[in-house]
Interface confidence: low
């Protein structure tokens, strides 16, 4: 229903605190380089304006769209041209082109300093001195580094962030209380950001139909007792929510997400028996809980799928009458029976089914043509099963660090043109699939592993899109959303790659490596490993292991030396020479 003033409507629905937080997130996600103080000033101006509209919806400019209001506000930033370059050209456009222009300039890998965590006492003092500013700063720093972070979920993270400081800053051992909580929030936040990035990529690169198919499959697995019509309604609403958030319409997104949570809880009897606990929580926790809720039990005695989708003489008639509805029903029925399959596998099966019907419904004898369609599913199911089995065995044999290294070598040989930091980041995340998923029983391994890999490979795709360097990456990323992982898995060593020139500087290390955390030291070693493979793509596993072995020994030796810097200089030269000899460089 139309409101005279959209900004007043959203302010009243969300309340001042959430309104201000969401506007701050929106602005920080668009203007990622702007200082915190500038954003706070803009947010306060927008909030004051919204209050005038609440008081009188007919007041001047209150009838303008949120995009117009927010875009006008962003375009008042004095340093737009010098800070953002061509993004300033967006301001010459009219809505909706202006907002589209801002969206296109969102940077998945902004050139921002790494967030360094201050001492616990320093953080607690800042929290007590000005709690509101402290929490706003958190929203700002996360939003500008993750321009697609799911805004209503970021409010949930901020609530937990505040709770952690409230509890721990008065604890006897502040650090012991606070640091594990902050680590958990950081890791969960990165995962949440990456999952949402895939949803936005799905909508923006492959369209609403692709996203809806994903949602049908996932919600059918989660709510197998719900009827198809119910699942379809939830899919439509969920698609609207994510379209809004991915499009920068954060106020509408948060409002609609709250409405969806309310609807789900009011209708939980016809959706899922697992929702009771979630629905007793406050709004932010409730929405998060619903999004993460475990799959409900499958209804007993579900009939065979073949009856309606293969044996029935009406298959082509039903398909022709409403193609997407019929395919949606197929996907719903298959997914609710298979919580043990990944969503992407279910979508591959649905695609195969669709292709078969397209071909067979135009054939002389359609039924005979599609009678064996389920046989075509077998290899599609076995491929991820075998891959996961092999990789979990490798993970169990090697442990996480060495498993990551195996993947680093594998992926560097596949796509050596990709930047070293991207290969390290992506391969490390791919390697985490082992500890995340291999502990699960068979029935949970595939949905855990393959859907996680989809999220990680999307990180590779969005980072590569910013500066494309490999046709193979572009091909795997753009041809089919659901076949990205099989596409990357199928890549062999890139025989066209011309090895990188050997540069001793790349393998020069200093005493600062000794004070790094274990994780940072691993990243240094893994960076060196990628560079080695780029210099010598045909190096055998044994050669690489030997060089990495000596590298680790060199680091350990020099970090124990009295004069560390001299050791790194002298031993480093020896190491480079030995490595060149070992690899035949």
């Amino acid at each position: 229903d139309a409101h005279k003033s959209e900004v007043a409507h959203r302010f009243k629905d969300l309340g001042e605190e959430n309104f201000k937080a969401l506007v701050l997130i929106a602005f920080a996600q668009y203007l990622q380089q702007c200082p915190f103080e500038d954003h706070v000033k803009l947010v306060n101006e927008v909030t004051e304006f919204a209050k005038t509209c609440v008081a009188d919806e007919s007041a001047e400019n209150c009838d303008k769209s949120l995009h117009t209001l927010f875009g006008d506000k962003l375009c008042t930033v004095a340093t737009l041209r010098e800070t953002y370059g061509e993004m300033a050209d967006c301001c010459a456009k009219q809505e909706p082109e202006r907002n589209e222009c801002f969206l296109q300039h969102k940077d998945d890998n902004p050139n921002l300093p790494r967030l360094v965590r201050p001492e616990v006492d320093v953080m607690c003092t800042a929290f007590h001195d000005n709690e509101e500013t402290f929490l706003k700063k958190y929203l700002y720093e996360i939003a500008r580094r993750h321009p697609y972070f799911y805004a209503p979920e970021l409010l949930f993270f901020a609530k937990r962030y505040k709770a952690a400081f409230t509890e721990c800053c008065q604890a006897a051992d502040k650090a012991a209380c606070l640091l594990p909580k902050l680590d958990e929030l950081r890791d969960e936040g990165k995962a949440s950001s990456a999952k949402q990035r895939l949803k936005c990529a799905s909508l923006q690169k492959f369209g609403e139909r692709a996203f809806k198919a994903w949602a049908v499959a996932r919600l059918s697995q989660r709510f197998p007792k719900a009827e198809f019509a119910e699942v379809s309604k939830l899919v439509t609403d969920l698609t609207k929510v994510h379209t809004e958030c991915c499009h920068g319409d954060l106020l509408e997104c948060a409002d609609d997400r709250a409405d969806l949570a309310k609807y789900i809880c009011e209708n939980q009897d016809s959706i899922s028996s697992k929702l009771k606990e979630c629905c007793e929580k406050p709004l932010l926790e409730k929405s998060h809980c619903i999004a993460e809720v475990e799959n409900d039990e499958m209804p007993a005695d579900l009939p065979s799928l073949a009856a309606d989708f293969v044996e029935s003489k009406d298959v082509c008639k039903n398909y022709a009458e409403a193609k997407d509805v019929f395919l949606g029903m197929f996907l719903y029925e298959y997914a609710r029976r298979h919580p043990d399959y990944s969503v992407v596998l279910l979508l591959r099966l649905a695609k195969t089914y669709e292709t078969t019907l397209e071909k067979c419904c135009a054939a002389a004898d359609p039924h005979e043509c599609y009678a064996k369609v389920f046989d075509e599913f077998k290899p599609l199911v076995e491929e991820p099963q075998n891959l996961i089995k092999q990789n979990c065995e490798l993970f169990e044999q090697l442990g996480e660090y060495k498993f990551q290294n195996a993947l680093l070598v594998r992926y560097t040989k596949k796509v050596p043109q990709v930047s070293t930091p991207t290969l390290v980041e992506v391969s490390r995340n791919l390697g985490k699939v082992g500890s995340k998923c291999c502990k699960h029983p068979e029935a949970k391994r595939m949905p855990c592993a393959e859907d996680y890999l989809s999220v990680v490979l999307n990180q590779l795709c969005v980072l590569h899109e910013k500066t494309p360097v490999s046709d193979r990456v572009t091909k795997c990323c753009t041809e089919s959303l659901v076949n990205r992982r099989p596409c990357f898995s199928a890549l062999e060593v890139d025989e066209t790659y011309v090895p990188k020139e050997f540069n001793a500087e790349t393998f020069t290390f200093h005493a600062d490596i000794c004070t790094l955390s274990e994780k940072e030291r691993q990243i240094k070693k893994q960076t060196a490993l990628v560079e080695l493979v780029k210099h010598k793509p045909k190096a055998t596993k044994e050669q690489l292991k030997a060089v990495m072995d000596d590298f680790a020994a060199f680091v350990e030796k020099c970090c124990k030396a009295d004069d560390k810097e001299t050791c790194f200089a002298e031993e480093g030269k020896k190491l480079v020479a030995a490595s060149q000899a070992a690899l035949g460089l």
Epitope: A546, D550, E556
Partner: nanobody
Framework: DVQLVESGGGVVQPGGSLRLSCAAS????????MGWFRQAPGKERERVVS????????YYADSVKGRFTISRDNSENTVYLQMNSLRPEDTATYYC????????????????WGQGTLVTVSS
């Protein structure tokens, strides 16, 4: 099947010497870093020394520096531990271990283990 067989242990007087050997079979010896660990009765197992695949890098625990020397012969698939100026506190069962990567000290980084050979330093 991978086997690591230690030998050379025994009873020796304080100040004396022993040479332990560890013969490896069933693995590509030159692809493994090798280490010696020891475990005294009622104590945790600790890494004493280790040597990289090519023999270019060695690690010695502070307690044995200057007294123990590790070496390897890749053609013979054997690693040696020369122990001089032995002390009563060196009494322990000595284990030979192989690691796919240079290992920085944790036991779990070593992939294969021998059965151990007992060294007793006593007057």
């Amino acid at each position: 099947d991978v086997q690591l067989v230690e030998s050379g242990g025994g009873v020796v007087q304080p100040g004396g010497s022993l040479r332990l050997s560890c013969a490896a079979s069933g693995l590509t010896f030159s692809s493994y870093a090798m280490g010696w660990f020891r475990q005294a009765p009622g104590k945790e197992r600790e890494r004493v020394v280790s040597i990289s695949r090519g023999g270019g890098y060695t690690y010695y625990a502070d307690s044995v520096k200057g007294r123990f020397t590790i070496s390897r012969d890749n053609s013979e698939n054997t690693v040696y531990l020369q122990m001089n100026s032995l002390r009563p506190e060196d009494t322990a069962t000595y284990y030979c271990a192989a690691a796919r990567y240079w290992a920085t000290g944790s036991e779990y980084e070593f992939d294969y283990w021998g059965q151990g050979t007992l060294v007793t330093v006593s007057s």
